[in-house]
Interface confidence: low
């Protein structure tokens, strides 16, 4: 083992290094001192470190560790933040298209119902957007409100357009009759089933991405314990006290230290793995009535079918409602002719047909594949950080926390640590409260994801969803149906080219990370990185 520096040597190299950390040299001895007051870099002989220097090294070591952790998670964090923004925006576009399709259907088939229908449709889709964002709105109430609002207009404009103004105060009665008489048949229930299932899945998908950001953000900004700070100081800086400026820590030693420092964080691993696998299950089940893109873009057709159902039963309904809502005289039913075949303005359904179009579902699968490459992120963190900080290759001629050794022995290093502080104790403390909280949140979202995921291997019986409603003849994988049932169904190849459209629709200013105005945290981080460059023990 190399001898400690002779007493007459100067501490010149240590002084010049330390000055980069702390301007001014008042804390650095000019020549080696006994160092009896040191608590971390316990000397085996004269030392070039003082207690104040040791404190500064500890602070620097913890800052370095935080920076290494942040750079380790940068790619994963960006992946989730970027996708959360893209999917949020894409879902908004789906809602906007669905609203436009529905309005076009009213305009082209039932012009006498506009503009009231536009208003009710607008309110419905606003609620859809809010629900996806996490509002506590009940989907059944949204659908009921849409049909409750539409029926009085349909009755007075289509079924009984000859009603005098004096009879138009029957609005509330008509709203009630709509449910009591099931005037739209089973269509409202069908829409409730499809919309609630698809929106629930969409909402939980976004919540899960949101939580993913929160998990990374929590572990990204962990404050490391003083014990960890001491271990890091001993690994990165104590060699300097002996004038060993070019020596690197042993790789095995680094792994032991990192596992000690990150014991709490690594506890997230089990739940993180489950999170990614549960999210994959959810994504695999997001098709047919579990795919909001498919459901919402087909609503115009189902709503059209529901109005046709009312028209077919108009004679019976007019008589019953005449009695129920106590008209002064019975009026003859007369209705303009409306074509059975659905007419859709070609401009509204103009879809770009491009080979290999990217749809939302392919983008979701792509995200899952990328996330799966981070499935071991937390268990691999200690190793990742060691590989991105200075360590000696092959564990030869390296620093083991106490001295320069030819070969690292974990047993010797552990024994050497025992009298300074117990590594096992550090691991036994359990995770930080913030880590425990994030584990609880992960457990909760994993539970939700599992409940929402469709059972494995479940095949929907031909055209029936589990409520027993016919959901349209959606056969092959390439042609996704937009439409509920009947002749009014339209097929659009590969749905919409959302991601191409995103380039046009996404307001660049609103994309996370593109904000012109720096957030307070941005300022902190940029300062922090500058600090890191100065403090870095990288040699």
């Amino acid at each position: 083992q190399p001898p400690p520096p002779p007493p007459d040597a100067t501490c010149h190299q240590v002084r010049s290094f330390f000055q980069r950390l702390q301007p001014g040299l008042k804390w650095v001895p000019e020549t080696p001192v006994p160092g009896s007051d040191l608590q971390v870099c316990l000397p085996k002989g004269p030392t070039c470190c003082s207690r104040k220097m040791e404190e500064k090294y500890q602070l620097t070591a913890r800052l370095n560790m935080e920076q290494l952790l942040q750079s380790a998670s940068m790619e994963l964090k960006f992946l989730i933040i970027q996708n959360a923004a893209v999917f949020q925006e894409a879902f908004e576009i789906v809602v906007r298209h669905a609203k436009n399709y529905t309005n076009a259907m009213f305009k082209n088939n039932y012009p006498s119902l506009t503009p009231q229908a536009f208003e009710f449709v607008g309110e419905f889709f606003t609620d859809v957007s809010l629900y996806i964002l996490g509002s506590d709105i009940n989907v059944d109430d949204m659908v009921n409100e849409l049909f409750d609002s539409l029926f009085p207009v349909i009755y007075t404009q289509l079924m009984n357009p000859g009603l005098p103004d004096s009879a138009l105060d029957i609005n509330e009665c008509l709203r009630g009759a709509r449910r009591d008489l099931k005037v739209f048949g089973n269509f409202p229930k069908l829409i409730m089933t499809q919309v609630s299932k698809s929106l629930q899945v969409t909402r939980i998908f976004l919540q899960a991405l949101n939580l993913g950001i929160e998990v990374i953000n929590t572990t990204d900004h962990l404050k490391f314990s003083k014990d960890c700070g001491r271990m890091l100081t001993r690994m990165w800086y104590c060699s300097y006290c002996q004038g060993l400026m070019m020596v690197k820590p042993c790789g095995g030693y680094c792994n032991v230290v990192m596992q000690g420092c990150m014991a709490g964080v690594v506890e997230i691993d089990k739940y993180w793995r489950e999170y990614i696998l549960s999210l994959e299950e959810l994504v695999n089940g997001m098709y047919r009535i579990y795919d909001m893109e498919n459901v919402l873009l087909g609503l115009f057709s189902t709503i059209h079918d529901s109005i046709q159902y009312v028209q077919k039963n108009a004679g019976k309904l007019t008589t019953t409602i005449g009695k129920l809502c106590a008209h002064s005289q019975q009026r003859q039913y007369r209705s303009a002719y409306y074509p059975e075949d659905l007419f859709i303005d070609k401009k509204v359904l103009k879809v770009a047909h491009v080979e290999h179009e990217e749809t939302l579902s392919s983008r979701r699968r792509e995200l899952i594949q990328k996330l799966k490459s981070f499935i071991s992120f937390y268990s691999a963190l200690p190793g990742y950080i060691c590989s991105h900080s200075p360590v000696a290759e092959n564990d030869t001629l390296c620093w083991n926390g106490q001295e320069l050794v030819e070969r690292y022995s974990q047993k010797a290093a552990r024994n050497g640590m025992k009298n300074q502080f117990n590594l096992h104790e550090l691991k036994m403390k359990g995770p930080e409260p913030v880590v425990s909280q994030i584990i609880d949140k992960l457990k909760h979202i994993n539970q939700l994801l599992r409940t929402m995921s469709m059972p494995k291997g479940r095949v929907l019986d031909k055209n029936l969803d589990e409520e027993g409603f016919e959901s349209g003849d959606c056969g092959d994988d390439e042609d996704e149906c937009i439409g509920g049932s009947g002749d009014g169904m339209i097929k659009v190849k590969n749905q919409l080219r959302f991601l191409a459209e995103l380039a046009y629709d996404l307001d660049v200013d609103d994309a996370p990370g593109n904000s012109q105005q720096a957030t307070p945290k941005d300022n902190e981080i940029s300062t922090f990185h500058n600090l890191g460059n100065v403090h870095s023990p990288l040699k």
Epitope: A84, A85, E89, G134, I213, E214, P512
Partner: nanobody, 123 residues
Framework: QVQLVESGGGLVQAGGSLRLSCAFS????????MAWFRQAPGKGRDFVAR????????DYADSVKGRFTVSRDNAKNTVSLQMSSLKPDDAALYYC????????????????WGQGTQVTVSS
């Protein structure tokens, strides 16, 4: 470009009340979810409360539930934070934040930030 300007901060005695306001300009306010965060000296930025685009959905940090109320006025383009039963722990720089995307408790979901307004609580 969205701009946010907070006001209403100041010195208040423990147990007292204060109302913070945030004026929003530059875009359609009703499309944005709004939130309040706070940062005490030497600490990280913590979520306080959030309100959805329509004002129907609100959410609070456990530490302020029952004492703080967040609201918005889409006609006036403002979001407010009514703070009552204030404690010394509530003293911090309060930031108003906006997002047109997902809104949650993570600061990095919010694209736009005000400069902050200082709240001091004396015991």
């Amino acid at each position: 470009q969205v701009q946010l300007v907070e006001s209403g901060g100041g010195l208040v005695q423990a147990g007292g009340s204060l109302r913070l306001s945030c004026a929003f300009s530059g875009r359609t306010f009703s499309k944005y979810a709004m939130a309040w965060f706070r940062q005490a000296p030497g600490k990280g930025r913590d979520f306080v409360a959030r309100v959805g685009p329509s004002g129907r959905t609100t959410d609070y940090a456990d530490s302020v539930k029952g004492r703080f109320t967040v609201s918005r006025d889409n006609a006036k383009n403002t979001v407010s934070l009514q703070m009552s039963s204030l404690k010394p722990d509530d003293a911090a720089l309060y930031y108003c934040a906006a997002t047109s995307g997902i809104y949650g408790e993570s600061y990095n979901l919010y694209n736009y930030w005000g400069q902050g307004t200082q709240v001091t609580v004396s015991s």
